[in-house]
Amino acid sequence: ILEAHYTNLKCRCSGVISTVVGLNIIDRIQVTPPGNGCPKTEVVIWTKMKKVICVNPRAKWLQRLLRHVQSKSLSSTPQAPVSKRRAA
């Protein structure tokens, strides 16, 4: 396990943004349901510009985006850019 300079928080997101992140700049999305000491759903997005950001799970644009990505992943074989998993 690598030592980290930052505090090991139970929740990873100390703040979230609600502003729209365009699908064309998204590299990965991770939706982490409540659990492991964090009582809330967390949505983390990795962008193609090498940034990682926390997004408001209730943002309407995000709900539309997740539905769009999941419907695409059901109808095609390439690996879906959305992963749903619990925090390690």
Epitope: A4, H5, Y6, R12, S14, G15, E42, W46, K50, V52
Partner: antibody, heavy 122, light 107 residues
Framework: QVTLKESGPEILQPSQTLTLTCTFS??????????VGWIRQPSGKGLEWLAN???????YYNPSLINRLTISKDTSNNQAFLKITNVDTTDSATYYC??????????????WGQGVMVTVSS | DIQMTQSPSSMSASLGDRVTITCQAS??????LIWFQQKPGKSPRPLIY???NLANGVPSRFSGRRSESNYALTISSLESEDMADYHC?????????FGAGTKLELK
């Protein structure tokens, strides 16, 4: 344990090319989200970000120096490199190799090397 | 580029003093700011990330806060080991930019 160590010439002349090597351990540049960069600090002055290179070979440069900088990596040997062409005395500084990892919370430059002092003098 | 205006450039304070260093961003950086501490002859290390979160092993006398585009680092009661240079960094967008640094000395 994460460590980074810079190496390169201590002194060089104006118009020469500076090549710096960062040798690191405790992490690899292969996994998703891992990056290495370079930051410099002239003696008694502030810090200046120069360049980053990521696991997927994506490169970012400081626009004020972009025409003179080249960052590269050798993933299998855990090394990163920075080349600065046509150096002059204003390039005299301590050069740091730094690690960044795209995890949340994202703390760029979470680990630093000890730095290597480079002097450009005629 | 985003400019980070850090002040003061240097200051002297006594042990036990409350010390505040500020950085002003030329545009909205949405808390994407880190404070680094650099002791003499050493490499910088992260003190505070996302403007207000304390890094691992950092004493609780250090704190960070934001007021609009102004970001502040405060040491509530200065200790001798806090004598160092302090740097702010914005990582909202490339190119990442640092403030000019603050040298904190003992009065």
């Amino acid at each position: 344990q994460v460590t980074l160590k810079e190496s390169g010439p201590e002194i060089l002349q104006p118009s020469q090319t500076l090549t710096l090597t960062c040798t690191f351990s405790g992490f690899s540049l292969s996994p998703y989200g891992m990056g290495v960069g370079w930051i410099r600090q002239p003696s008694g002055k502030g810090l200046e970000w120069l360049a980053n290179i990521w696991w997927d070979d994506d490169k970012y440069y400081n626009p004020s120096l972009i025409n003179r900088l080249t960052i590269s990596k050798d993933t299998s040997n855990n090394q990163a490199f920075l080349k600065i062409t046509n150096v002059d005395t204003t390039d005299s500084a301590t050069y740091y190799c730094v690690r960044s990892e795209l995890v949340m919370p994202y703390v760029p430059f979470d680990y630093w090397g000890q730095g290597v002092m480079v002097t450009v003098s005629s | 580029d985003i400019q980070m205006t850090q002040s003061p450039s240097s200051m002297s304070a006594s042990l036990g003093d409350r010390v505040t260093i500020t950085c002003q961003a030329s545009q909205d950086i949405e808390n994407d700011l880190i404070w680094f501490q650099q002791k003499p002859g050493k490499s910088p290390r992260p003190l505070i990330y996302y403007a207000t979160n304390l890094a691992n092993g950092v004493p609780s006398r250090f704190s960070g806060r934001r007021s609009e585009s102004n970001y502040a680092l405060t040491i509530s009661s200065l200790e001798s080991e806090d004598m160092a240079d302090y740097h702010c960094l914005q990582f909202k967008q490339y190119p990442y930019t640092f403030g000019a640094g603050t040298k904190l000395e003992l009065k």
